[in-house]
Amino acid sequence: AVNGTSQFTCFYNSRANISCVWSQDGALQDTSCQVHAWPDRRRWNQTCELLPVSQASWACNLILGAPDSQKLTTVDIVTLRVLCREGVRWRVMAIQDFKPFENLRLMAPISLQVVHVETHRCNISWEISQASHYFERHLEFEARTLSPGHTWEEAPLLTLKQKQEWICLETLTPDTQYEFQVRVKPLQGEFTTWSPWSQPLAFRTKPAALGKDT
């Protein structure tokens, strides 16, 4: 089993959380494993217990401090180790030098709200959560709108190439129910990826005024 393929992937949320996934072909589901984080220039270290998320995949969150505290910087390197229990001892299964700001995945945007809605338009705003002040304005967003009779996968992506925490959706159909989602990504980091999608925001456009041509 050890010679099979494995995956050890971790992301930093830019503040005080490193989330990790460890997968190993042929590994036993009840194996007890953990991730240990040892920064090269900090006095703290942290451990989290890997919990099963699928047949041969485990995940955990290294909580480094208060959610909005800035626990790591661009110069930090964190040695991450996967340790699994074998009998009475812990055995190191994998090691990785982790540069937090090269491996970013932010929290999903929050507090989505309809600022203004009309028959064909809707203005929506949101906030980013637990994002480092280091980014300043170096963030981008993707948004998508779910139309009736379609799936999220079919929804065209709208790209906002700057830190803009609002959008004006246009060419909407009157008196129609829609859902909206947004995600965020820093411009920095070789292995940086998109945040999860936000919780969907449901809204309805206003009906067309009677007697008006729509």
Partner: nanobody, 121 residues
Framework: QVQLVESGGGLVQAGDSLRLSCAAS????????MGWVRQAPGKEREFVAG????????LYADSVEGRFTISKDNAKNTGYLQMSSLKPEDTAVYYC??????????????WGRGTQVTVSS
């Protein structure tokens, strides 16, 4: 992609020592991990040792722990495997491999062509 070239293999007696080198080029290893994987005749590939390029954290297979030492020279972009107290069962082609992490397995992103180590009794 990283290009890897191994050297230092050869024929030695049981109990002797040998040092393998792995020269990396193509891009900076930065925070990559360099591993050594071996394949004996008629057997599957086997993880030997690994070292992270940033902090020098190491990982060894049980079969070589205490006998083999993995190290690196960042300035030369070269990794080393110092093999001591060699045994006939260490006979294999030794491959250098690089990925974002090292683990006790044999699937890595970049590979060298290998260097033959033969230990006679």
């Amino acid at each position: 992609q990283v290009q890897l070239v191994e050297s230092g293999g050869g024929l030695v007696q049981a109990g002797d020592s040998l040092r393998l080198s792995c020269a990396a080029s193509g891009r900076s290893l930065s925070t990559d991990c360099m591993g050594w994987v071996r394949q004996a005749p008629g057997k599957e590939r086997e993880f030997v040792a690994g070292i992270t390029w940033g902090t020098g954290s190491t990982l060894y297979a049980d079969s070589v722990e205490g006998r083999f030492t993995i190290s690196k020279d960042n300035a030369k972009n070269t990794g080393y495997l110092q093999m001591s107290s060699l045994k006939p069962e260490d006979t294999a082609v030794y491959y250098c491999a690089v990925d974002r992490y090292c683990y006790r397995g044999t699937v890595y992103r970049d590979w060298g062509r290998g260097t033959q180590v033969t230990v006679s009794s």
